[in-house]
């Protein structure tokens, strides 16, 4: 591992659609990928009338958008489905939303997912 870099070997796994997809609902996912490429964790969720609904969590392949991010933070302004990625084992256990917008608009509070 490169000094100062968190290598991702496993991520929190969650699938809201687990019955239809015939997977576990929750657990720990080992991350696979090309040996020289970086691996990350991700989380996706929806905000339904102020209520946070996790869609999926798991491993994510080498992506410069995720480099050196120890926290899973969505920065896109009001996406349909929120997505964040990070580096480090189980770094997707917590995720938050801090949109990058004009200074006049306040940022949102961090989101702590409700247990399934």
């Amino acid at each position: 591992a490169i000094l100062g870099r968190s290598e991702t070997q496993e991520c929190l796994f969650f699938n809201a659609n687990w019955e239809k997809d015939r997977t576990n609902q929750t657990g720990v996912e080992p991350c696979y990928g090309d040996k020289d490429k970086r691996r990350h964790c991700f989380a996706t969720w929806k905000n339904i009338s102020g209520s946070i609904e996790i869609v999926k969590q798991g491993c994510w392949l080498d992506d410069i958008n995720c480099y050196d991010r120890t926290d899973c933070v969505e920065k896109k302004d009001s996406p349909e489905v929120y997505f964040c990625c990070c580096e480090g084992n189980m770094c997707n256990e917590k995720f938050s939303y801090f949109p990058e917008m004009e200074v006049t608009q306040p940022t949102s509070n961090p989101v702590t997912p409700k247990p399934p």
Epitope: K37, F42, V55, L61, N65, P79, E80, V81, Y82, F83
Partner: antibody, heavy 115, light 111 residues
């Protein structure tokens, strides 16, 4: 092993639409992006757009904005690229590629636009 | 994002070295280590050779190397072989907040 298998060649009339599919196997489809690239006969590669296969979020090249739609069907591990209002200049081989680095490519789909 | 600039063609004899350049701007090539190189033989799909400026893709011979100086990325092929004759494209990472762009391509002829 990772494979991206694309749908077969298409011949289309000007003004119509085409939808090309790209079926992924050998990796977890929802763990990366799918990018779409085209190559006109004797020309270079041209990036069209990308989709995040888990969130469905898309980005398109300005040139194709409003004319291209990229979607992903998680249940079949398949990505789709639909191009509308076709013109003769859209005659090209269309490729899908995995991830932001384009590390695996489909075999290509020739779309011919001719009246 | 405007296309990256590559020479139309380069050539070299077997055993020689050739370098293909890819020039962008300070806001793309100059700012990020996200330039890739692809090899394409006639009638075939492109193949990733180098990613992230200088990282060799798995299975790619170490005769292929990538580097960057300022706003220009370079692909160097040493010990040229007949099978290296192909078109080479530089391109950028695409996904998330990054938009893709390719160079115009360089035809490598092995004399």
């Amino acid at each position: 092993q990772v494979q991206l298998v694309q749908s077969g060649a298409e011949v289309k009339k000007p003004g119509s639409s085409v939808k090309v599919s790209c079926k992924a196997s050998g990796y977890k489809f929802t763990s990366s992006y799918i990018n779409w690239v085209r190559q006109a006969p004797g020309q270079g590669l041209e990036w069209m757009g990308t989709i995040n296969a888990v969130s469905g979020s898309t980005s398109y090249a300005q040139k194709f904005q409003g004319r291209v739609t990229i979607t992903a069907d998680e249940s079949t591990s398949t990505a789709y690229m639909e191009l509308s209002s076709l013109r003769s200049e859209d005659t090209a081989v269309y490729y899908c590629a995995r991830g932001g680095w384009f590390d695996y490519w489909g075999q290509g789909t020739l779309v011919t636009v001719s009246s | 994002q405007s296309a990256l600039t590559q020479p139309r063609s380069v050539s070299g004899s077997p055993g020689q070295s050739v370098t293909i350049s890819c020039t962008g701007t300070s806001s793309d090539v100059g700012s990020y280590n996200y330039v890739n190189w692809y090899q394409q033989h006639p009638g075939k799909a492109p193949k990733l050779m180098i990613y992230g400026v200088s990282k060799r893709e798995s299975g790619v011979p170490d005769r292929f190397s990538g580097s960057k100086s300022g706003n220009t990325a370079s692909l160097t092929i040493s010990g040229l072989q007949a099978e290296d004759e192909a078109d080479y494209y530089c391109g950028t990472f695409a996904g998330g907040k990054y938009y893709g762009v390719f160079g115009g391509g360089t035809k490598l002829t092995v004399l």
